[in-house]
């Protein structure tokens, strides 16, 4: 399992992971105590047939070519959590691991 | 976690799981001994903002709106394996659980 890594200077048109820092402060999300920003990354690019396909299923659907199937798209295939400190709806401070906050790898699915 | 289920008569335009039977025999994939066909399903439909979003990350990327991020797409969010009997490249018969062969749920990511 592997995926491409790109940056803002890359000329890669295929599905790739790009750096992105999410800034909660800039969003006005004041209920998040920490972190105020974190490296989230995101996926972007084209999914040509077979390139970076995560699942055999993606290839099979392409073969079967059913009505309305749009072909694979560039999406996170591996994600990881981050620890966060935040206020919940009852104004209690919660410290917890929030799943799927960071994109570690991108692929076509 | 939930996802929509549709069929060929559905008028649903949003991200939905549709039935699809994959027929290995029709593909000429004769190295697969069994099953000769199975119910794979596939995802299709539109991903309006927030609808069926699997990860908070998807929402955050939409907020941050980086260059080239195409918005979420309708993709498998839950998959399951099937048991298969097949020949490997060394012409040995292998019996094993092949992951991510069936789409159980679709969502926007």
């Amino acid at each position: 399992d592997f995926g491409l890594d790109c940056d803002e200077h890359s000329t890669e048109s295929r599905c790739c992971r790009y750096p992105l820092t999410v800034d909660f402060e800039a969003f006005g999300w004041d209920w998040i105590i920490a972190p105020k920003r974190y490296k989230a990354n995101y996926c972007s690019g084209e999914c040509e047939f077979v390139f970076l396909q995560k699942y055999p299923h993606t290839h099979l659907v392409h073969q079967a070519n059913p009505r309305g199937s749009a072909g694979p798209c560039c999406t996170p295939t591996k994600m990881s959590p981050i620890n966060m400190l935040y206020f919940n709806g009852k104004e209690q401070i919660i410290y917890g691991k929030i799943p799927a906050m960071v994109v570690d790898r991108c692929g076509c699915s | 976690d939930f996802g929509l289920d549709c069929d060929e008569h559905s008028t649903e335009s949003r991200c939905c799981r549709y039935p699809l039977t994959v027929d290995f025999e029709a593909f000429g994939w004769d190295w697969i001994i069994a099953p000769k066909r199975y119910k794979a399903n596939y995802c299709s439909g539109e991903c309006e903002f927030v609808f069926l979003q699997k990860y908070p990350h998807t929402h955050l990327v939409h907020q941050a709106n980086p260059r080239g991020s195409a918005g979420p797409c309708c993709t498998p969010t839950k998959m399951s394996p099937i048991n298969m009997l097949y020949f490997n490249g060394k012409e040995q018969i292998i019996y094993g659980k092949i992951p991510a062969m069936v789409v159980d749920r679709c969502g926007c990511s």
Epitope: - | E25, D30, I32, I33, A34, M84, L85, F87
Partner: antibody, heavy 124, light 107 residues
Framework: QVQLVQSGAEVKKPGASVKVSCKAS????????MHWVRQAPGQGLEWMGN????????NYNQRFKARVTMTTDTSTSTAYMELRSLRSDDTAVYYC?????????????????WGQGTLVTVSS | DIQMTQSPSSLSASVGDRVTITCKAS??????LSWFQQKPGKAPKSLIY???RLVDGVPSKFSGSGSGTDYTLTISSLQPEDFATYYC?????????FGQGTKLEIK
């Protein structure tokens, strides 16, 4: 529908070879194991071996291994069973049979279709 | 090799009777047992697979049961067309082995 049509009866001398054919129709020939089973006059059934036409991988009963060869011609969807060094006790009806998988386990199958049989008589 | 012992080797019965044929394996065959019917001059015909599953198109008067080493074929109400020879087959391991057959005759 699935059909297995075998070649006609043969009379052979001891020490000779015989090649029995089994022509398949009504299904994708390359994707199903073909087995060979024989039956001596008034006797029971005896498994000889099988072949997978897609890649020619075969599995023989040890009892026949030195004398039998199973082959296929995918262009004509035909399976062949050749038995060499014939003896009088090889006089039998030889059947081909298709193995059909109802599940995915290695033994999740049964014989769903049989050829009509080919009588091979070995006599001096 | 796994030995399959079928009994009885022959059986006389009347139309309408219920008959049972047994097959004993020399070791556990994990229910990988099939039953066949064979009429004179004809190829065998599959009746039952995986010990108790009926092949499509086979009448429900045929039933199979058993596990481990002991298996039975039951014909609930004999009709004239059921008089034939019946064989069991184990497919749990190679080489495949058949029982020696049970000849079912009209009394």
């Amino acid at each position: 529908q699935v059909q297995l049509v075998q070649s006609g009866a043969e009379v052979k001398k001891p020490g000779a070879s015989v090649k029995v054919s089994c022509k398949a129709s009504g299904y994708s020939f390359t994707g199903y194991f073909m087995h060979w089973v024989r039956q001596a006059p008034g006797q029971g059934l005896e498994w000889m071996g099988n072949i997978y036409p897609y890649n020619g991988v075969s599995n023989y009963n040890q009892r026949f291994k030195a004398r039998v060869t199973m082959t296929t011609d995918t262009s004509t969807s035909t399976a062949y069973m050749e038995l060499r060094s014939l003896r009088s006790d090889d006089t039998a009806v030889y059947y081909c049979a298709r193995r059909y998988y109802y599940g995915t386990g290695p033994a999740d199958w049964y014989f769903d279709n049989w050829g009509q049989g080919t009588l091979v008589t070995v006599s001096s | 090799d796994i030995q399959m012992t079928q009994s009885p080797s022959s059986l006389s019965a009347s139309v309408g009777d219920r008959v049972t044929i047994t097959c004993k394996a020399s070791q556990d065959i994990n229910s990988y047992l099939s039953w066949f019917q064979q009429k004179p001059g004809k190829a065998p015909k599959s009746l039952i697979y995986r010990a108790n599953r009926l092949v499509d198109g086979v009448p429900s008067k045929f039933s199979g049961s058993g596990s481990g080493t002991d298996y039975t074929l039951t014909i609930s109400s004999l009709q004239p067309e059921d008089f034939a020879t019946y064989y069991c087959l184990q497919s749990d391991e190679f080489p495949l082995t058949f029982g020696q057959g049970t000849k079912l005759e009209i009394k």
